[in-house]
């Protein structure tokens, strides 16, 4: 008789989620020299761990330290780019401007960029029909509680100037609910961090409105000031410029505004 | 804007030895993999090996492990490729190669440096 | 060493028509695989990592898919300047290519 599964709202974990991690550590310690101590099966043990056997709607950021310890990894603090609803542009733009560090460009981000997994209660199986989502099931499931606790690692490390990336044609540029919204605002360090500084991707060509003066930017403007860290806002009027610009700098058209 | 600027084409004997430069420029030098590609005339690609000029880590394609050294000079954000005990074999074109922030792909290429190999 | 085996060697098509190139790799090389275009007297280029992701600028005719061992390229609506030959490679362990395949105008 085959026993009873817990139906979840949300897509099941990622085909071949095991292995497609266990790659993704291997491929990220060969090409980062200063990750190569990292042990990845230690890593899949430990990604494992957090989540195996256990109620997927009860997991804490507690289950995640023993992966959170084999994955500290140091970036410029002063380097560090956040984004919202616009992971694509902001992954394209630190492809060029390495000097900048997305989230998904350390070890653990990448590991489980674009991934969904989930167990069972008091089994050892993986979850490939159905895993719950944030709103419809619950919020303390194994993917959010591994994206709020890395998220909120990666902001706590954060000096000096912040950006943020942000989606110009969304109706909430910035959604006190993202995770950008919930969990970095707010662990920014004012003792370290100076400013925040957004940039507000246009999505049409003809945008020329000033979007830094939209009720969101001015809602977070005030959450980051209230936190005594200063804040400014920047207008991307033409994403597809703006890269080529950050790519070839000395552009006699990148001395325009972009 | 990223650019690699390799060395002019280069005549030798066989038995002689020749050492190919691989000029960066437009990013950070010590930050990316440099790779070399061989591509003889008509023919497939084939990596060599590559180097990582932030703390000289070198990986090497076993066939190439004696034939070619890869080196660099972060202060001038310069590639170096030498290969040793030449034969007609080694006649082809060379080429520097970048990869992407994780190695994903080889983003940007050099021109190439054309090898002749001849007694 | 993982080998790749690419085909067909040789490919004619007409502008506008949709071609697909294959590569088998001889071990799981888990999505790392690109694709390159490389016209005579020319450096390569990429078009595709990790199996589908496309590089800024790059025309959205062209498409990369599968996993494993087996990948393709698509090339939708192909127009004169895709021409050229293409290879794939493995970048999951020693970045080895496969042998390519020309594709020439019919």
């Known amino acids: 008789v085959p026993r009873w599964r817990q139906q979840w709202s949300g897509p099941g974990t990622t085909k071949r989620f095991p292995e497609t991690v266990l790659a993704r550590c291997v491929k990220y310690t060969e090409i980062h020299p200063e990750m190569r101590h990292v042990d990845c099966q230690s890593v899949w043990d430990a990604f494992k761990g957090a989540f195996i056997s256990k109620h997927p709607c009860n997991i804490t950021e507690e289950d995640y330290q023993p992966l959170m310890k084999l994955g500290t990894q140091t970036v410029p603090c002063n380097k560090i780019l956040l984004w919202s609803r616009i992971k694509d542009l902001a992954h394209q733009f630190t492809q060029v401007q390495r000097d900048m560090f997305t989230l998904e460009d350390t070890l653990l981000g990448y590991l489980a960029d674009d991934l969904t997994w989930c167990g069972e209660f008091n089994t050892s199986k993986i979850n490939y029909q159905s895993c719950p989502d944030w709103r419809k099931d619950c919020s303390n499931n194994p993917v959010s509680v591994f994206w709020k606790t890395v998220s909120r690692r990666f902001a706590e490390a954060a000096c000096d100037v912040v950006h943020v990336m942000l989606n110009g044609s969304r109706s909430k540029i910035f959604d006190k609910n993202s995770t950008f919204g919930s969990v970095e605002v707010h662990n920014l360090q004012p003792e370290k961090v100076q400013t925040l500084e957004a940039w507000v991707i246009h999505g049409g060509r003809e945008d020329s409105r000033d979007l830094c003066q939209d009720p969101t930017i001015k809602e977070l403007e005030s959450i980051i000031s209230k936190r005594n860290i200063q804040f400014s806002c920047k207008n991307i009027y033409r994403p597809d410029k703006f890269l080529q610009c950050v790519k070839n700098p000395e552009d006699s058209s990148c001395t325009s505004e972009i | 804007e990223v650019q690699l600027q390799q060395s002019g084409t280069v005549l030798a004997r066989p038995g002689a030895s020749v050492k190919m430069s691989c000029k960066a420029s437009?990013?950070?030098?010590?930050?990316?993999?440099m790779h070399w590609v061989k591509q003889r005339p008509g023919q497939d690609l084939e990596w060599i090996g590559g180097?990582?000029?932030?703390?000289?880590?070198?990986r090497y394609n076993q066939k190439f492990k004696d034939k070619a050294k890869l080196t660099a000079v972060t202060s001038t954000s310069t590639a170096y490729m030498e290969l040793s005990s030449l034969t007609n074999e080694d006649s082809a074109v060379y080429y520097c190669?970048?990869?992407?922030?994780?190695?994903?792909?080889?983003?940007?290429w050099g021109q190439g440096t054309l090898v002749t190999v001849s007694a | 060493d993982i080998q790749m085996t690419q085909s067909p060697a040789s490919l004619s098509a007409s502008v506008g028509e949709t071609v697909t190139i294959t590569c088998r790799a001889s071990?799981?090389?888990?999505?790392?695989l690109a694709w390159y275009q490389q016209k005579q007297g020319k450096s390569p280029q990429l078009l595709v990592y990790n199996a589908k992701t496309l590089p800024d600028g790059v025309p959205s005719r062209f498409s990369g898919s599968g996993s494993g061992t087996q990948y393709s390229l698509k090339i939708n609506s192909l127009q004169p300047e895709d021409f050229g030959t293409y290879y794939c490679q493995n970048i999951w362990t020693n970045y080895t290519f496969g042998g390519g395949t020309k594709l020439e105008i019919k």
């Open positions: 180097f990582y000029p932030g703390n000289s880590d070198t």
């Open positions: 190669t970048r990869g992407d922030r994780h190695d994903e792909g080889f983003a940007y």
């Open positions: 071990g799981n090389i888990h999505n790392y």
């Open positions: 437009g990013y950070t030098f010590t930050r990316y993999w």
